[in-house]
Structure formats: C-alpha cells, structure tokens
C-alpha cells in the first residue's frame, strides 16, 4: 500500500500549567531526508493549523519563534509539546506528516489526539 501510516495517542490530559505532550509516529514508506510535521486542531468541523515545522532527518524540529509548539525528533518519531493551553482549547489535535524530500512525496494524517484542558481553580484567599 503506497500510503504512510501515522500513529498518535487517542487521549492526553494537559497539565495544570496548560502543557500537553504526545508522540506522533509515522511508518515511512520512503527514505525521506526532509519531513514536515503539522499539528491541526479540529473542533466543530472547523480545522485550524496550530503549528508546523520542517526538519532534516537527524536534526531538531524548528518551530517559529512565536509558536506554541516545541518538539524533538528521533527516527520516525516526533515528540510534540503544546503550551499555553486553556479549557477553551480542548479539542482534537491531529498530527499530519509529509515526506517532502526527496521525491516521491507522501502524506500521512493521524486519527487525532483528544486533548483535555482543565483551567486550574483560582487559589482561595489566605487569612494568613
């Protein structure tokens, strides 16, 4: 089958500081040297790009400076971290992988990771 399978966890719970991490793993049908990873958020049938990074195999992922994502790569596995999440950001986060170079191009889209974000309770006023 000339397709690329992408695996990611079904559910992740963000930390109380609004940070969520998950692994995106892809089964590469070719020997890519350049890979692009995009995180998409799907909510109410609307799709938005959360962040994207292109990296050379063996090198680190480089997201834009103002990106809410960071990540590291190891072989065909990408460890993604999304920061600054709030309860309203709860949704399905989909990992999309593209083998950019050399040809042929391959596209792989994961089933998505449902990220649950719970805003921390405000600290009660202290009498001390």
């Amino acid at each position: 089958c000339k397709a690329m399978h992408v695996a990611q966890p079904a559910v992740v719970l963000a930390s109380s500081r609004g940070i969520a991490s998950f692994v995106c793993e892809y089964a590469s049908p070719g020997k890519a040297t350049e890979v692009r990873v995009t995180v998409l958020r799907q909510a109410d049938s609307q799709v938005t790009e959360v962040c994207a990074a292109t990296y050379m195999m063996g090198n680190e992922l480089t997201f834009l400076d103002d990106s809410i994502c960071t990540g590291t790569s190891s072989g065909n596995q990408v460890n993604l971290t999304i920061q600054g999440l709030r309860a309203m950001d709860t949704g399905l986060y989909i990992c999309k992988v593209e083998l950019m170079y050399p040809p042929p191009y391959y596209l792989g889209i994961g089933n998505g990771t449902q990220i649950y974000v719970i805003d921390p309770e405000p600290c009660p006023d202290s009498d001390f």
């Epitope: 000339k2 397709a3 950019m100």
Partner: antibody, heavy 118, light 108 residues
Framework: QVQLVESGGGVVQPGRSLRLSCAAS????????IHWVRQAPGKGLEWVAV????????HYADSVKGRFTISRDNSKNTLYLQMNSLRAEDTAVYYC???????????WGQGTLVTVSS | EIVLTQSPGTLSLSPGERATLSCRAS???????LAWYQQKPGQAPRLLIY???SRATGIPDRFSGSGSGTDFTLTISRLEPEDFAVYYC?????????FGQGTKVEIK
C-alpha cells in the same frame, strides 16, 4: 473568501515559452501547497506540478520535468508556471489548485487556456 | 505511479435515478487519500468527497462515497438536473497525484 485567478495563457508556437500566473487571496498563502493541473481539450485532468509552503520543495510530472518550472512569491500571494520548449501536447486549460489540510484540492481557479500551434 | 480506472465511461440516467460510479486503483490506496470531483462544461472541477467518504463543505447529502483498498464508489442517491456532469476520482497520498479518466453522467 478563497480565490485563485490564473492569467498568462494564449497562443504560442512550438518550442517557445510562456509564463502563467495564479493570484491567490482569502487565505494564508504560505500555509498551503499549490498545484498546477491541466486539461487538454475534451480530455481528463492531468497533474502537472506542485510547490510547497516556503517554495523550496517542488515536484513535477514526468511529462513536464526539465521544461516547466513552478515558483511562488509568498509576499505577493502569487504562483507561477514557467513553461519552456512547449509542444503541441501541452495545449490545455491550466488550473491552479490549493491542496487543503487533508490533502485534496479544495479550491481551483477558473483556468487559463494555453494553445501551442504553429 | 498509481493508475485509477473509472467505470463506466458514460452513465445514461434520468433525473431521480440512482447513479453508481466506480474507481479502481492499480494498487492499494489508503481510503484517507481518495477524492471525488465534479466538473461541468467550461468550469473548474469542484471537490465533492475526500477521505473516500467525507463530504466537502456545501456538498448535498445525496452524494456519498465508500470503498477501501483498490475499489471505491461514488453514489448519487437521486439525480438532480444539476448533477449531470463528469466525475473524477483522485488519489493524493503520494506523488505523482493521479486522476481517473472520468465518468460522464448524462441525461437519458
């Protein structure tokens, strides 16, 4: 709203060159791969070329490799197709199309006709 | 290169009838990466179905897609006058991007 508008088509002699343009609006141009697809008169759709995101990566159909060059100017939201050494079999309507996040081509231009004839 | 073969070449039907269009791939295609387009004379193609079975924005529910592996189907449950057109399948999981040769749905 998303719009793609092609221009630059016309009649050209075999062996000559032509440059097509595709002006995009209504979306973040640099976040999408953009393709050229052509359709010979009365025939089906044939993929021609694609250029990705920042413009560094490109892929071509074997039928145009070495003759056609795809490029983009993200500051102008414009896609180009430089067509050299044109042949009669390159006669077609040329469409630019946006590849959406999931992979299919969700928006197409109206097309521009290229006729290669002596 | 994945070759897509559509059948039949032409389908002659009346409004209100059901249309079943077939697309067969030369090798297995992930259903996530199979699309259907509609094209009317003098117009650009329009995306109908992606991921083999998901309807694109604004596409009426009389259009449905199904299939996996090498065999895919586009079904139009009840043909409306505006549905008479040429339909193309496409795979977009790997380069080169390929289209079927098209099926023309014409009025009987």
């Amino acid at each position: 709203q998303v719009q793609l508008v092609e221009s630059g088509g016309g009649v050209v002699q075999p062996g000559r060159s032509l440059r097509l343009s595709c002006a995009a609006s209504g979306f973040t141009f640099s976040s999408y791969g953009i393709h050229w697809v052509r359709q010979a008169p009365g025939k089906g759709l044939e993929w021609v070329a694609v250029i990705w995101y920042d413009g560094r990566n490109k892929h071509y159909a074997d039928s145009v490799k070495g003759r056609f060059t795809i490029s983009r100017d993200n500051s102008k939201n414009t896609l180009y197709l430089q067509m050299n050494s044109l042949r009669a079999e390159d006669t077609a309507v040329y469409y630019c199309a946006r590849q959406d996040y999931w992979g299919p081509f969700d928006y197409w231009g109206q097309g521009t006709l290229v006729t290669v004839s002596s | 290169e994945i070759v897509l073969t559509q059948s039949p070449g032409t389908l002659s039907l009346s409004p209100g009838e059901r249309a079943t269009l077939s697309c067969r791939a030369s090798q297995s295609v992930s259903s996530s990466y199979l699309a259907w387009y509609q094209q009317k004379p003098g117009q650009a193609p329009r995306l109908l179905i992606y991921g083999a079975s998901s309807r694109a924005t604004g596409i009426p529910d009389r259009f449905s897609g199904s299939g996996s592996g090498t065999d895919f189907t586009l079904t139009i449950s009840r043909l409306e006058p505006e549905d008479f057109a040429v339909y193309y399948c496409q795979q977009y999981g790997s380069s080169p991007w390929t289209f079927g040769q098209g099926t023309k749905v014409e009025i009987k």
